[in-house]
Interface confidence: medium
C-alpha cells in the first residue's frame, strides 16, 4: 500500500535569463528512496540513482545543476522552459511517486542583468 | 507587487548569533530560500524551506544555520548561529526558489572582532 506523499514547490515563476530551483520532498512513508528522476514533459533532465549519484542529461548539462538534496536547480531559462516538470521517486517497495511542478518563464527588460547563482 | 524585504542583519563577533526575516508581500509562496553574496564574490544558495516545513541546506551553513517559515505573516526566517568571518556578506531572501531582477536591497551580515 503506497502511503507517500509528495510536496512540491507548486507553480513557480522566474525571470529569462534568470535561475530557479525545482525541489520534491517525499513524506508519510519509509519506502526507501531508490532513485529520482527529473523530466520535463517527455524529456530527461536529469537523475539522481541512490548507488550512483547524480547523472545530467547530455543536452541540459550547461544549464542543469544537480542539488540541493535531491532538487534540481536550472539556470539561464529561456521562456521555452516553461512548463511541467515531474519529479519521479522510484521507491521499494511502495513503486513510484510522481510530483509536478509547472514553471512559468517570463521576459524581462531586464532578463540580461539576471543573475545566476552557485550551489556550494 | 510582490516585494521581498530582508532585515536583521548587523555586525557580530565571530561565534555570535543573528536572526534574519524576510517579509514578502503580494501573495503567499510555497517555497522561500535565502542567498548571499560576499564581496567580489558570486552570489551563491544558503538554504530553502518548503510550505510544509522541509528544509535545505548548503553545506557550508549546515549545523550552524536554520531556515523557517511562517505562513501566516508570510515571513521567512534565517537564524544564523556560530557565525564565522567567511559568512559575511549581503544576504538576501528569495521567493519561489528563484528571483525576479531587480533584487532586493537585501541586509548586510558582518562577522568581525
Known amino acids: 500500500m503506497m502511503t507517500g506523499t509528495i510536496e512540491t514547490t507548486g507553480n513557480i515563476s522566474a525571470e529569462k535569463g534568470g535561475s530557479i530551483i525545482l525541489q520534491c520532498h517525499l513524506s508519510s512513508t519509509t519506502a526507501q528512496v531508490t532513485q529520482v528522476n527529473w523530466e520535463q514533459q517527455d524529456q530527461l533532465l536529469a537523475i539522481c540513482n541512490a548507488d550512483l549519484g547524480w547523472h545530467i542529461s547530455p543536452s541540459f548539462k550547461d544549464r542543469v545543476a544537480p542539488g540541493p538534496g535531491l532538487g534540481l536547480t536550472l539556470q539561464s531559462l529561456t521562456v521555452n522552459d516553461t512548463g511541467e516538470y515531474f519529479c519521479i521517486y522510484h521507491t521499494y517497495p511502495d513503486g513510484t511517486y510522481t510530483g509536478r511542478i509547472f514553471l512559468e518563464v517570463l521576459e524581462s527588460s531586464v532578463a540580461e542583468h539576471g543573475a545566476r547563482f552557485q550551489i556550494p | 507587487e510582490v516585494q521581498l524585504v530582508e532585515s536583521g542583519g548587523g555586525l557580530v563577533q565571530p561565534g555570535g548569533s543573528l536572526r534574519l526575516s524576510c517579509a514578502a508581500s503580494g501573495r503567499t509562496f510555497s517555497f522561500m530560500g535565502w542567498f548571499r553574496q560576499a564581496p567580489g564574490k558570486e552570489r551563491e544558495w544558503v538554504a530553502s524551506?518548503?510550505?510544509?516545513?522541509?528544509?535545505w541546506y548548503a553545506d557550508s551553513v549546515k549545523g550552524r544555520f536554520t531556515i523557517s517559515a511562517d505562513n501566516s505573516k508570510n515571513t521567512a526566517y534565517l537564524q544564523m548561529n556560530s557565525l564565522k568571518p567567511e559568512d559575511t556578506a549581503v544576504y538576501y531572501c528569495?521567493?519561489?526558489?528563484?528571483?525576479?531582477?531587480?533584487w532586493g536591497q537585501g541586509t548586510l551580515v558582518t562577522v568581525s572582532s
Open positions: 524551506v518548503l510550505r510544509g516545513g522541509y528544509t
Open positions: 528569495a521567493k519561489d526558489g528563484g528571483w525576479f531582477d531587480p
